[in-house]
């Protein structure tokens, strides 16, 4: 056959679907690779062809669209499973072509099993809720297009293994789950099960997401430098190791980049001709507030190094702060015998 633009295996789209549930999978060509949509392609006389490679096989084979009850079908640029089976797992290819044009892409589809408590190998999306912030909602994801708006599905929400009736502060409201005030105890996996009828059959869609309760923007503050501070003086003799920790607290801020850096005499450590190493560690609180520690280390400090200015800087979306460390050269203690002699001489 003639040459075809092959976009290869699109591993960015690792599609996972539950066994024995409907799945609708759009051909990724129109979403990520081509600059036109399916309608335009269809109008231009292009045909969309589907085929697949079973798991642990190399052989590409056509998809059987003649299964009982139309279990697998194609509608426009969507491949439908009503429902999936475990052995539908494999790499699926959609190819758009006519006599002069050809473009194709493959993507992996994994059909996964779940237990009675909705545990599975499925990668779960994470939804962040602000702690004690206001009424916040999560919505049952990826259910659009499965049934027409005239069909009224039943939706049941679960936390972990248990059906949510209104416990504590959480109210099921159809496709939404409302958190009146989010508390840390709301952390966990939430599952919506959508049940709808189609052609005399009943289908279930199971969608699980992880809720993580994070710091509220109303409590967010600019970075706080705990160290260096005015109470600690770094007093060293030449030849000793100088270790200065810079410890900074960052409030959780959605999509904020938290940064900590040192300057020595106003320059980045890399731009100073001394042997400096900086080690960073990061820890998080339960609400994802962050504490970053950067330890500046000079193995064998010189008297010149002890005269330099060491400043710790921190920046987040809330602002920028800086704090200088107090570094001094240790004054050698006067020798005891000399001190005594002077003392006696004075009497």
């Amino acid at each position: 056959s003639e040459r075809c633009d092959d976009w290869g295996l699109d591993t960015m789209r690792q599609i996972q679907v539950f066994e024995d549930e409907p799945a609708r999978i759009k051909c990724p060509l129109f979403e990520h690779f081509l600059k036109f949509n399916y309608s335009t392609a269809h109008s231009a006389g292009l045909t969309l062809i589907w085929y697949w490679t079973r798991q642990d096989r190399d052989l590409e084979e056509p998809i059987n669209f003649r299964l009982p009850e139309n279990r697998i079908s194609k509608e426009k640029d969507v491949l439908w499973f009503r429902p999936t089976l475990l052995n539908d797992t494999g790499n699926y290819t959609c190819m758009l072509r006519n006599t002069t044009y050809c473009s194709k892409v493959a993507f992996p589809l994994e059909v996964v099993q779940k237990d009675s408590c909705f545990n599975s190998p499925m990668k779960l999306p994470v939804h962040k809720l602000y702690i004690e912030y206001g009424i916040q909602r999560i919505t049952c994801p990826n259910v659009d297009g499965y049934f027409p708006s005239s069909v009224k599905p039943t939706i049941t929400w679960y936390m972990g293994c248990y059906k949510i009736q209104n416990f504590n502060n959480v109210i099921p409201e159809g496709m939404n789950l409302s958190f009146l005030i989010a508390f840390i105890s709301n952390n966990g996996n939430y599952t919506c099960v959508v049940t709808y009828p189609e052609n005399g059959r009943t289908f279930h869609l199971t969608r699980t997401l992880t809720v993580k309760v994070v710091g509220s923007p109303k409590n967010a503050v600019p970075p706080v430098i705990h160290s260096p501070n005015d109470h600690v003086v770094y007093e060293k003799e030449p030849g000793e190791e100088l270790l200065i920790p810079c410890t900074v607290y960052f409030s959780f801020l959605m999509d904020s980049r938290n940064e900590v850096w040192w300057t020595i005499d106003g320059k980045k450590p890399d731009d100073i001709p001394i042997d400096v190493t900086i080690n960073e560690s990061i820890s998080h609180s339960r609400t994802e507030d962050e504490t970053r520690t950067q330890i500046l280390s000079i193995k064998k400090v010189t008297s010149e190094d002890l005269k330099r200015s060491y400043v710790c800087h921190a920046r987040s979306a809330k602002g920028e702060v800086a704090k200088a460390a107090t570094v001094k050269q240790k004054v050698p203690a006067p020798r005891y015998t000399v001190e005594l002699a002077c003392g006696f001489g004075a009497t």
Epitope: G134, I135, M159, G160, C161, Y162, Q165, N166, F167, N168, N169, I171, L180, I181, F183, I184, S185, N186, N187, G188, R286
Partner: antibody
Framework: EVQLVDSGGGLVKPGGSLRLSCAAT????????MSWVRQGSGKGLEWVGR??????????DYAAPVKGRFTISRDDPKNTLYLQMNSLKTEDTAVYYC??????????WGQGTLVTVSS | DIVMTQSPLSLPVTPGEPASISCRSG???????????LAWYLQKPGQSPQLLIY???NRASGVPDRFSGSGSGTDFTLKISRVEAEDVGVFYC?????????FGQGTRLEIK
């Protein structure tokens, strides 16, 4: 199915002690705030106290009449809520219920256990 | 403490007729987040109380739609559109805005 089973009630002399238990099933007990509510014979409902989930700080609040005498605790691995009652008075005589929730009201209740304080 | 006051304390009703109970709080029960921290309960003879209404106006699951709650701030009402014999018992309102959580004195509904 959510179930709360209250136990531990009985007859006790004034100044005595008693420990009530509430065994919970059908929900993730460790996530839920739990309260005790009591009801004297022919009287209305009276809130006794509440314990938050440990993840929410485990804070315990008490009604003024029982503060310093009653202690609420929870054993999450055992899915059990407790009410330790010391220095009991005749006015503590009531049916004691354990309940779940708070903000949305108490949505599930135990069957109640009768505590009688009498000499 | 927030004082909850119910009226009437006794309510004789003919089956099929509507009934209404009022509950007043000593201070506003409107939470900063915009909802009212008020619940209604029915305690049938010899049973534990059951939740009817939460957040002032939301019917709890399994509660017949003849029960409805309304009001905001300090004034709340529980309405029964058509009383049935099985509704006999004591109705309580309760505030959950702050501890100590407090209940109304109760309204006894009886069939005429």
């Amino acid at each position: 199915e959510v179930q709360l089973v209250d136990s531990g009630g009985g007859l006790v002399k004034p100044g005595g002690s008693l420990r009530l238990s509430c065994a919970a099933t059908g929900f993730t007990f460790s996530n839920v705030w739990m309260s005790w509510v009591r009801q004297g014979s022919g009287k209305g409902l009276e809130w006794v106290g509440r314990i938050k989930s440990k993840t929410d700080g485990g804070t315990i609040d008490y009604a003024a009449p029982v503060k310093g005498r009653f202690t609420i605790s929870r054993d999450d691995p055992k899915n059990t809520l407790y009410l330790q009652m010391n220095s009991l008075k005749t006015e503590d005589t009531a049916v004691y219920y354990c309940t779940t929730g708070e903000l949305l009201g108490f949505d599930y209740w135990g069957q109640g256990t009768l505590v009688t304080v009498s000499s | 403490d927030i004082v909850m006051t119910q009226s009437p304390l006794s309510l004789p009703v003919t089956p099929g007729e509507p009934a209404s109970i009022s509950c007043r709080s000593g201070q506003s029960l409107l939470h900063n987040n915009g909802f009212n921290c008020l619940a209604w309960y029915l305690q049938k003879p010899g049973q534990s109380p059951q939740l009817l209404i939460y957040l002032g106006s939301n019917r709890a699951s399994g509660v017949p739609d003849r029960f409805s709650g309304s009001g905001s701030g300090t004034d709340f009402t529980l309405k029964i559109s058509r009383v049935e014999a099985e509704d006999v018992g004591v109705f309580y309102c309760m505030q959950t805005l702050q501890t100590p959580i407090t209940f109304g004195q109760g309204t006894r509904l009886e069939i005429k």
